[in-house]
Amino acid sequence: LPAQVAFTPYAPEPGSTCRLREYYDQTAQMCCSKCSPGQHAKVFCTKTSDTVCDSCEDSTYTQLWNWVPECLSCGSRCSSDQVETQACTREQNRICTCRPGWYCALSKQEGCRLCAPLRKCRPGFGVARPGTETSDVVCKPCAPGTFSNTTSSTDICRPHQICNVVAIPGNASMDAVCTSTSPTRSMAPGAVHLPQPVSTRSQHTQPTPEPSTAPSTSFLLPMGPSPPAEGSTGD
């Protein structure tokens, strides 16, 4: 014979637990119904009457099956540096995430409590590690043969252009300036080129066929010591 289905509230068998979507009420000593997401317990069960549930009020929610007497308050409205990625409903909390150009400096269970602007690498420095939702940009000084002339949270150090004839040698914050009208660009971004004597380079009349091994101009201007503060601007 099939086992008889017990309707809530019911006394559980000794040593057994209540079924899914039920809870054991310590006072009534009965298995009683939980309330569905979006609801809360308005009246707790007794030995003969089951839980009575009610809808969460505006700006409150319950996400799980529950027997709480009061719904949880939704978080406060998203701040100006945030976007609302999930609205407050009866079944879920509002989720605020950082808007583009910002990262989460202090997270909470879901979303972000405090956003901060992504660090901007100043000229002479490029992005070593891009920012993520939860981490700031890391800047690094541009290596010989590379430069960055922008204040940016996304720009990396780019290789200097390679000149047939150099007018102004490049440095960490400035590209090389060529006298010829057809400069070439290094194919290997960030590659560090070995310096070559200027005299051998100035005789070329054609672009270098293998730019990846072409000479760099960065040795002509000493970089000097890197300034402190990781080459960043902003907060």
Epitope: T27, A41, K42, T46, T48, S49
Partner: antibody, heavy 119, light 106 residues
């Protein structure tokens, strides 16, 4: 508005039965989720919960006094009763009745009635 | 039975002080704790339900917090009308009152 008022004998002798009545207005014990409870307080001491009764006649008693307590109700007359058998001087106290919210806390209280057990 | 340990039994405060009362339960009561204020010769008056929800008419200087077995009640800025005895009540497993904390003026 919700109001509760306790009444009792005032004085009684050891071994007698104490009968208390709580008469209330502003709510009904036929309303789903409503309960009434009894709490007492000996002079200069703390509060002690005694018993509760619910709209559906479910009853709960303080385990340490359970065999001496009986709670009942008269829904149509808005009354709840508490009987305590075999009283002694330790039962001398102010007795309060209180309404119980559906989520089980005491939200409205009567003014209390003083009961003295003395030989 | 759940045992409730309320402390301290008495408390002296100056006007404007912040005072805190704690209640510890012998088992988890799932935040089902209420706080009451009682003045001499009067019935208790409920201030807080479900750990931290202020009852209608309770001034915002009163607050409650806690979970599991540890709960607290605070008055942030004591006023003369707050001089009373305060009780915690657990209602997660039957009903038990704490022994009370008498708040006095220094």
């Amino acid at each position: 508005q919700v109001q509760l008022k306790e009444s009792g004998p005032g004085i009684l002798q050891p071994s007698q039965t104490l009968s208390l009545t709580c008469t209330f207005s502003g709510f009904s014990l036929s309303t789903y989720g409503v309960g009434v409870g009894w709490i007492r307080q000996p002079s200069g001491k703390g509060l002690e919960w005694l018993a509760n009764i619910w709209w559906d006649d479910d009853k709960y008693y303080n385990p340490s006094l359970k065999n001496r307590l009986t709670i009942s109700k008269d829904t149509s007359n808005n009354q709840v009763f508490l009987k305590i058998t075999n009283v002694d001087t330790a039962d001398t106290a102010t007795y309060y009745c209180a309404r119980i919210d559906g989520t089980r806390y005491f939200d409205y209280w009567g003014q209390g009635v003083m009961v003295s057990v003395s030989s | 039975d759940i045992v409730l340990t309320q402390s301290p039994p008495s408390l002296s405060a100056s006007l404007g002080d912040k005072v805190t009362i704690t209640c510890q339960t012998s088992q988890n009561i799932n935040k089902f704790i209420a706080w009451y204020q009682q003045k001499p010769g009067k019935a208790p008056r409920q201030l807080i339900r479900y750990t931290s929800t202020l009852m209608s008419g309770t001034p915002s200087r009163f607050s409650g917090s806690g979970s599991g077995t540890d709960y607290s009640f605070s008055i942030s800025n004591v006023e003369s009308e707050d001089i009373a005895t305060y009780y915690c009540l657990q209602y997660g497993n039957l009903w038990t009152f704490g022994r009370g904390t008498k708040l006095e003026l220094k």
